[in-house]
């Protein structure tokens, strides 16, 4: 999916209002310095591309993120403010259904969510730079 035509301001508002709080809740008990950020993004479409992939693509070390509240809200936000996004996400929905139901938060998942927070913060910063 090409995120170029999304309403970035609306996505930013949704992130600040709800998604960020859910991410921080998920990370509760860990310090921001506990994990190294190893990925970043360059502009708004790039940030959303990587956020989408990291949130919804299961990895061997952390297969369960797509079921989390922040992931559900991320999906809803992208569907709302990115034209045609929801039509491209049938496969992602299947991946979510296959995701583990276990609510155990592993260290690797915490690390992945730490990376997500970094990508979202970069998204906000690139938005501020463009204004």
């Amino acid at each position: 999916y090409d995120f170029t035509n999304c309403d970035f301001q609306k996505i930013e508002a949704d992130y600040l209002r709800t998604i960020s709080k859910d991410l921080i809740t998920y990370m509760s008990g860990t310090k921001s310095t506990d994990f190294n950020n190893t990925v970043s993004c360059s502009n708004r479409p790039h940030c959303l591309t990587e956020i989408q992939s990291l949130t919804f693509n299961p990895t061997p070390r952390c297969a369960s993120l797509a079921k989390e509240m922040f992931a559900r809200k991320t999906k809803a936000t992208l569907a709302l403010w990115c034209p045609g996004y929801s039509e491209t996400q049938i496969n992602a929905t299947q991946a979510m259904k296959k995701a583990r139901k276990s609510k155990v938060t592993t260290n690797k998942c915490l690390e992945q969510v730490s990376q997500l927070l970094g990508l979202w913060r970069r998204f906000i910063r690139t938005l501020l730079k463009k204004q």
Epitope: V39, S40, S42, P45, N57, T59
Partner: antibody
């Protein structure tokens, strides 16, 4: 410390597919970062080809996108480049590199690939 | 596509002298600029990222400055091992990251 090593055929015929592999040691490619390919034609500058992230997303240079595939094998801790329909213009030293999806902080030594019949 | 233009193509200097290399972008890249050093037969090495941050292990004699479209890499006092080709790279315009054509710093 992470080390990267490119391997693959040094000679490819025009119209065929160039295939290279980058073996990574000292760091798990599924733990973090992105893993990238960059090339440098003889005596010329650098050109970014694309990357695959540790979580599997890929991004390619638009000028090469229709011909490029980057994939990974986490069990072998390596990632690969396939470039189809090559011409003499694809003759270059091909580097693999670690990236934070923006810039490139560790590089392999490079491998020269010549496209010729 | 953002075109990166480096000048001069070649810089002839003596050890101990100050080197000033220029990189100009065809449109603003904010502070999203990196510098690399490449010696003959070797891979490039990251020197500077985000315009002015030194990469791990890079000596303090290397510094970067600029913003928008005009950037500078300065080597305060050239050491014998600094004679090489230097490339700038913009990463503002994903997915079209681009490099300059290089500046060769040679011994005078």
């Amino acid at each position: 410390q992470v080390q990267l090593q490119e391997s693959g055929p040094g000679l490819v015929k025009p119209s065929e597919t160039l295939s290279l592999t980058c073996a990574v040691s000292g760091y798990s490619i599924s733990s973090g970062y992105g893993w990238s390919w960059i090339r440098q034609p003889p005596g010329k500058g650098l050109e970014w080809i694309g990357y695959i992230s540790y979580y599997g997303s890929t991004s390619y240079n638009p000028s090469l996108k229709s011909r490029v595939t980057i994939s990974r094998d986490t069990s072998k801790n390596q990632f690969s480049l396939k470039l189809s329909s090559v011409t003499a213009a694809d003759t270059a030293v091909y580097y693999c590199a670690r990236t934070n999806l923006l810039y490139f902080d560790s590089w392999g030594q490079g491998t020269l690939v010549t496209v010729s019949s | 596509e953002i075109v990166m233009t480096q000048s001069p193509a070649t810089l002839s200097l003596s050890p101990g002298e100050r080197a000033t290399l220029s990189c100009r972008a065809s449109q603003s890249v904010s502070s999203y600029l990196a510098w690399y050093q490449q010696k003959p037969g070797q891979a490039p090495r990251l020197l500077i990222y985000d315009t002015s941050s030194r990469a791990t292990g890079i000596p303090a004699r290397f510094s970067g400055s600029g913003s928008g479209t005009d950037f500078t890499l300065t080597i305060s006092s050239l050491e014998p091992e600094d004679f090489a080709v230097y490339y700038c790279q913009q990463y503002s315009n994903w997915p079209q990251y681009s490099f300059g054509q290089g500046t060769k710093v040679e011994i005078k």
